[in-house]
Amino acid sequence: AITEAREEAKPYPLFPGPFPGSLQTDHTPLLSLPHASGYQPALMFSPTQPGRPHTGNVAIPQVTSVESKPLPPLAFKHTVGHIILSEHKGVKFNCSISVPNIYQDTTISWWKDGKELLGAHHAITQFYPDDEVTAIIASFSITSVQRSDNGSYICKMKINNEEIVSDPIYIEVQGLPHFTKQPESMNVTRNTAFNLTCQAVGPPEPVNIFWVQNSSRVNEQPEKSPSVLTVPGLTEMAVFSCEAHNDKGLTVSKGVQINIKAIPSPPTEVSIRNSTAHSILISWVPGFDGYSPFRNCSIQVKEADPLSNGSVMIFNTSALPHLYQIKQLQALANYSIGVSCMNEIGWSAVSPWILASTTEGAPSVAPLNVTVFLNESSDNVDIRWMKPPTKQQDGELVGYRISHVWQSAGISKELLEEVGQNGSRARISVQVHNATCTVRIAAVTRGGVGPFSDPVKIFIPAHGWVDYAPSSTPAPGNADPVLII
């Protein structure tokens, strides 16, 4: 707000006497008087004590009129230099100056610690113009001071492209000690020394620190802030705080818990997220970390079959994300699974063991020793094989799939046959004479179809040929066997 008292108010007792300083009589060069573009901050009525003229920062703008009339020097009047007050109290201070109207264009602003207080709602300027002089009082008020209001305040008047600066007004807000650094919670190794820091400031200074452990003072004599407490070591959890004292009273920091690092608790809630024939995806809930971050976890897997040799497979993984896919497992097998995690102190106990099973998979090998021969009398092709080893069946055999491809004079057709699980032979009708028949066999479980055997070829002659001999799966390294009868 800005208040202007018109001429009739004439409040000039506030500004007794002549302008500060003496008039300049020498003829100084004409100096341009550019416009002032500063902001005229807001103001309010607040009488100031008439002080002696301030001669320390007198501006004598180097300006003369067209008629060489000198401009008088200008200076802010002295005011209070240092204000000490308690936090949350109100304060009001001002600077005042009398400006001859011949200056014609000025702006006044408040600055704090070198920064302009723009648009400050608690700044008020009133001015009292008459025909020769305008008396200006710039007031600054703070309704409830805080520590952040501490600092050096000045008024600046911009006039004739020069600045006139008032004496600084130092505001010192006093209150209870204010913590700038408080002790922080820590997790420490048993019987290992550690430090805690506490720092508090006034004003007023000095600030003295007492340390408190589990409600008892640690130091008999206070230490000047800042204070570092060295604790030689703990065997059990403790709570520390610090007290900061100054002439205004006492402030107590937050209490911080110092924990002793220990081995973690075992994980809980190990659960199966997904099972396949050869892998199991598990998750777990980590136990209490023992005040030390988990580093990694170990998954222990053993076959649940009583006839197994009892060996344990161990899989190490990172502590996060509490999820692990156990691979290289046998199909249709039962396993016991446990999880243990470690921190810098050591390994947790193993979680409660859980049972998990892999599912059936497709067989991993093809039937062995496939042989094929022509039974011309019945116009059939007989096929024999041996079933894959039990361990590689990856489940319970439900049968076989036979692929037979007939090729003759550029024509090719494939047929598929399904055979029950008990057999190890099959008979298929001759589809085309004077043709090559290529046979492949795959074992089938509920988990899927396994790989097909290597192809066995047999030539089926035209009607009237009598001799025949079997064709069989080739020995390794031999290419497609073809027996022509």
Epitope: A1, I2, T3, E4, L30, S32, L33, P34, H35, A36, S37, G38, Y39, Q40, P41, A42, V63, T64, S65, V66, K69, L71, V99, P100, N101, I102, Y103, Q104, D105, T106, T107, I108, L118, G119, T125, F127, P129, D131, E132, T134, I136
Partner: antibody, heavy 120, light 107 residues
Framework: QVQLVQSGAEVKKPGASVKVSCKAS????????MNWVRQAPGQGLEWMGW????????TYADDFKGRVTFTLDTSTSTAYMELRSLRSDDMAVYYC?????????????WGQGTTVTVSS | DIQMTQSPSFLSASVGDRVTITCKAS??????VTWYQQKPGKAPKLLIY???TRHTGVPDRFSGSGSGTDFTLTISSLQPEDFATYYC?????????FGQGTKLEIK
């Protein structure tokens, strides 16, 4: 009482110059800055600049720099505004207006206005 | 430059009405805003300065308010002599700039 009296209406040709006077009375002329403001027909107010009546130092608005000159005759408490190279869009009422106080930039006293017509 | 935008440009009202004219600055001008009244063929007259202070001799039905960027001129009960054009002006910084004006007409 405080008043500002301006010179009479002017009719000028494009390219010519016009000089408007503003005579102050009822106060100390050199204590108050003098501003010049114009108003085209049916339009708003446009600030042209001001002159410090004590030092004679003028300040011109950017739109008028190079074409306008403010001068003073302190012996007769008169301010002058000269506008050169007149154009048709300079046709307006030109006002002088007193700057209110040393810390204020508004106008408490205005002249009656001078109409400038630019016509070929 | 700081732009001053007045609204409305035209306002029709009757004697006894309460009317409000607003002025918006393009940037913070604190409370360095003044209002003028201008009647046809006459020079503007100062009404309000420092956003809310009435000039000497201005009737108290005229009031101003606002700070920062938003300002209002209020006429609490229109009188026949109040029908005129009203201008706001900022003087926080040079160049001094005016609003485009609000013409108050009899309904």
């Amino acid at each position: 009482q405080v008043q500002l009296v301006q010179s009479g209406a002017e009719v000028k040709k494009p390219g010519a110059s016009v000089k408007v006077s503003c005579k102050a009375s009822g106060y100390t002329f050199t204590n108050y800055g003098m501003n010049w403001v114009r108003q085209a027909p049916g339009q708003g107010l446009e600030w042209m600049g001001w002159i410090n009546t004590y030092t004679g130092e003028p300040t011109y608005a950017d739109d008028f720099k190079g074409r306008v000159t403010f001068t003073l005759d302190t012996s007769t408490s008169t301010a002058y505004m000269e506008l050169r190279s007149l154009r048709s869009d300079d046709m307006a009422v030109y006002y002088c207006a007193r700057k209110s106080t040393v810390v204020s930039r508004y106008f408490d006293v205005w002249g009656q206005g001078t109409t400038v017509t630019v016509s070929s | 430059d700081i732009q001053m935008t007045q609204s409305p440009s035209f306002l029709s009202a009757s004697v006894g009405d309460r009317v409000t004219i607003t002025c918006k600055a393009s940037q913070d001008v604190g409370d360095a805003v003044t209002w003028y009244q201008q009647k046809p063929g006459k020079a503007p007259k100062l009404l309000i300065y420092w956003a809310s202070t009435r000039h000497t001799g201005v009737p108290d039905r005229f009031s101003g308010s606002g700070s920062g960027t938003d300002f209002t001129l209020t006429i609490s009960s229109l009188q026949p002599e109040d029908f005129a054009t009203y201008y706001c002006q900022q003087y926080r910084s040079y160049p001094l700039t005016f609003g485009q004006g609000t013409k108050l007409e009899i309904k």
